[in-house]
């Protein structure tokens, strides 16, 4: 029986060009965590495996950093990074737990001010 729950950072926002930490925490279970997957829509971003440690998907190596802990750090954010992110915990004997985070990447305040106020 699956008794665990996943707590996430929920809906978060960050500025374009900045970085953000995606965090999930599995609680209320003694299940062994075999692996944690991080996904954006249908794309696998990274894996943290109990035996092997971290593996970052080649297409995200430049902008994704492992940690802290089982979390994931996204760097050099673009507006295209806006969307749903999922942490998938593979555990035994429970099975799989999924957490959802929605990230909104906003135009930086500098860019907004630059667009609004013209220097004569």
């Amino acid at each position: 029986m699956m008794t665990g729950t996943i707590e996430t950072t929920g809906n978060i926002s960050a500025e374009k060009g900045g970085s953000i930490i995606l965090q999930c925490h599995l609680s209320s279970t003694t299940a062994q965590v075999t692996q944690v997957n991080w996904e954006q829509q249908d794309q696998l971003l990274a894996i943290c495996n109990a035996d092997l440690g971290w593996h970052i998907s080649p297409s995200f190596k430049d902008r994704v950093a492992p940690g802290p802990g089982l979390g994931l750090t996204l760097q050099s954010l673009t507006v295209n990074d806006t969307g749903e992110y999922f942490c998938i915990y593979h555990t035994y004997p429970d099975g799989t737990y999924t957490g959802r985070i929605f990230l909104e990447v906003l135009e930086s305040s500098v860019a907004e001010h630059g667009a609004r106020f013209q220097i004569p």
Partner: antibody
């Protein structure tokens, strides 16, 4: 090309033991979670055991727990299944399988080796 | 344990037909549903995982859909090499369990 080649099957009496082997090639064996799945004659598939990439953790269903032991030798690219206290209901074709790195599914299967438990 | 019920258990179809196989789980499996193909004397092949993700090398005529407890495998235009037995498998909760299989035969 990924290849999984099982061996060690045969006829054994109830209460007996057997050790299955699976020789893996065509991929970095030590990076992958591996499993055994079986199929009784004319029946469906049943997951039998799983071992993590480094061999740290092993998982079993209740039907074989305490009787079967999965292990691996990453230096030999080989997966094993030690089967003790065999019963008639363990009669099946046993498949060696590799899991996707994401652990969502078993992406490669061997051809299988047949285990018959009968007196 | 989660029971996986596949239907139909067998079907007859012709080349070019659209074929649909369904798999029902006894409880919500959150899209952790895979489809495999088995042919006599051949290794089992993974077709789709996580409900709808096509495994590498699998033709696009295979597709998957569903959510909750109900899932579907569709072959849009049946080819001669598709005559085989198809199994679903849930990867949500241990022990991971399989459906009973659907044998697709030539009409």
């Amino acid at each position: 090309e990924v290849q999984l080649l099982e061996s060690g099957g045969g006829l054994v009496q109830p209460g007996g033991s057997l050790r299955l082997s699976c020789a893996a090639s065509g991929f970095t064996f030590s990076n992958y979670v591996m499993s055994w799945v079986r199929q009784a004659p004319g029946k469906g598939l049943e997951w039998v055991s799983t071992i993590t990439s480094g061999g740290t953790y092993t998982y079993y269903p209740d039907s074989v727990k305490g009787r079967f032991t999965i292990s691996r030798d990453n230096s030999k690219n080989t997966l094993y299944l030690q089967m003790n206290s065999l019963r008639a209901e363990d009669t099946a074709v046993y498949y060696c399988t590799r899991w996707l790195l994401s652990l969502y599914a078993m992406d490669y299967w061997g051809q299988g080796t047949t285990v018959t438990v009968s007196s | 344990d989660i029971q996986m019920t596949q239907s139909p258990s067998s079907l007859s179809a012709s080349v070019g037909d659209r074929v649909t196989i369904t798999c029902r789980a006894s409880q919500d499996i959150s899209n952790f549903l895979n489809w495999y193909q088995q042919k006599p004397g051949k290794a089992v092949k993974l077709l789709l995982y996580y409900t709808s993700r096509l495994h590498s090398g699998v033709p696009s005529r295979f597709s998957g859909s569903g959510s909750g407890t109900d899932y579907t495998l569709t072959i849009s235009s049946l080819q001669p090499e598709d005559f085989a037995t198809y199994f679903c498998q849930q990867g949500k909760t241990y022990p991971y369990t399989f459906g009973g299989g659907t044998k697709v035969e030539i009409k």
